[in-house]
């Protein structure tokens, strides 16, 4: 649910961590309606989730955490 | 309703481990995370580390990484936590508790009733 | 992490605050979540999304946020309510994501 590069709305799907290979962070005061995660997946898809979501800040520590021990 | 059994009470050695189980029951195993908190007497509440089964992915707090290995088996709906090289100061109630993961509110709904761990020579 | 007052009292009827102090990668920036843990029980959610009762919680306790800090209201007290009531947010950059403030315990007087 992108547009123009900016998230439009989030996914209702739950996506699993092994498929995702990094995020990009969309602040609604930077240009954007709304705060967003967004996903970038192995597919070289762009998914956009609600980065208020339980499932998705755990995704997002995980990563951060990866890329802190690298 | 969903509950989360936990197992009972356990007496350890300083430098042993021990391992404690969660089991879910009345509920599918998807789309919640399993966290453990603990409780030192006392003493206010602590996480230690959680899964996401269907991630099959666990996080552990800072001060427990290395020391403990948190596992998830679908099959029978339970969570594991071991912890390992215990100390004095490990001497806690060790509880249970639920997360839905696709809400935005980050609480603990469910709870279980806790398992004690005592620590001594 | 989240600072609370160790203590706070009241008598039955009257309204007691308990205050939760945090900083902006947790309270700032995600949601507030209220335990009550009666004696020699595991804890009970109270209050979460910052001012949100699951079902079954009595109205008389309410739940804001403003800010870095967060509070608690119990309306009404009674000799029930005499508890260790814990808040709890998730944290975006600590060590471990769920961080909890030590407790104040509710005297009934």
């Known amino acids: 649910a992108s547009n123009f590069d900016c998230c439009l709305g989030y996914t209702d799907r739950i996506l699993h961590p092994k498929f995702i290979v990094g995020f990009t962070r969309q602040l609604a005061n930077e240009g954007c309606d709304i705060n967003a995660i967004i996903f970038h997946t192995k597919k070289k898809l762009s998914v956009c989730a609600n980065p208020k979501q339980t499932w998705v800040k755990y995704i997002v520590r995980l990563l951060s955490k990866k890329v802190k021990n690298m | 309703e969903v509950q989360l059994v936990q197992s009972g009470a356990e007496v350890r050695k300083p430098g042993s481990s021990v391992k404690v189980s969660c089991k879910a029951s009345g509920d599918t195993f998807n789309n919640f995370a399993i966290s453990w908190v603990r409780q030192a007497p006392g003493h206010g509440l602590e996480w230690v580390g959680g899964?996401?089964?269907?991630?099959?992915?666990?996080d552990y707090a800072q001060n427990f990484t290395g020391r403990v290995t948190i596992s998830a088996d679908k099959a029978t709906k339970t969570v594991y936590m071991e912890l390992r090289s215990l100390r004095y100061d490990d001497t806690a109630v060790y509880f249970c508790?639920?997360?839905?993961?696709?809400?935005?509110?980050?609480?603990?709904?469910?709870w279980g009733r806790g398992t004690t761990v005592t620590v001594s020579s | 992490v989240l600072t609370q007052p160790p203590s706070a009292s009241g008598t039955p009827g009257q309204r007691v605050t308990i205050s939760c102090s945090g900083s902006?990668?947790?309270?700032?920036?995600?949601?507030v979540v209220w335990y009550q843990q009666l004696p020699g029980a595991a804890p009970k959610l109270l209050i979460y999304s910052n001012d949100q009762r699951p079902s079954g919680v009595p109205d008389r306790f309410s739940g804001s946020r403003s800010g870095t800090s967060a509070s608690l209201a119990i309306s009404g007290l009674q000799s029930e309510d005499e508890a260790d009531y814990y808040c709890?947010?998730?944290?975006?950059?600590?060590?471990?994501?769920?961080?909890f403030g030590g407790g104040t315990k509710v005297t009934v007087l």
């Open positions: 902006t990668s947790n309270i700032g920036s995600n949601a």
């Open positions: 709890a947010a998730w944290d975006d950059s600590r060590d471990g994501p769920w961080v």
């Open positions: 899964i996401i089964p269907v991630f099959n992915t666990a």
């Open positions: 508790a639920r997360t839905k993961i696709e809400l935005d509110n980050d609480a603990f709904d469910i």
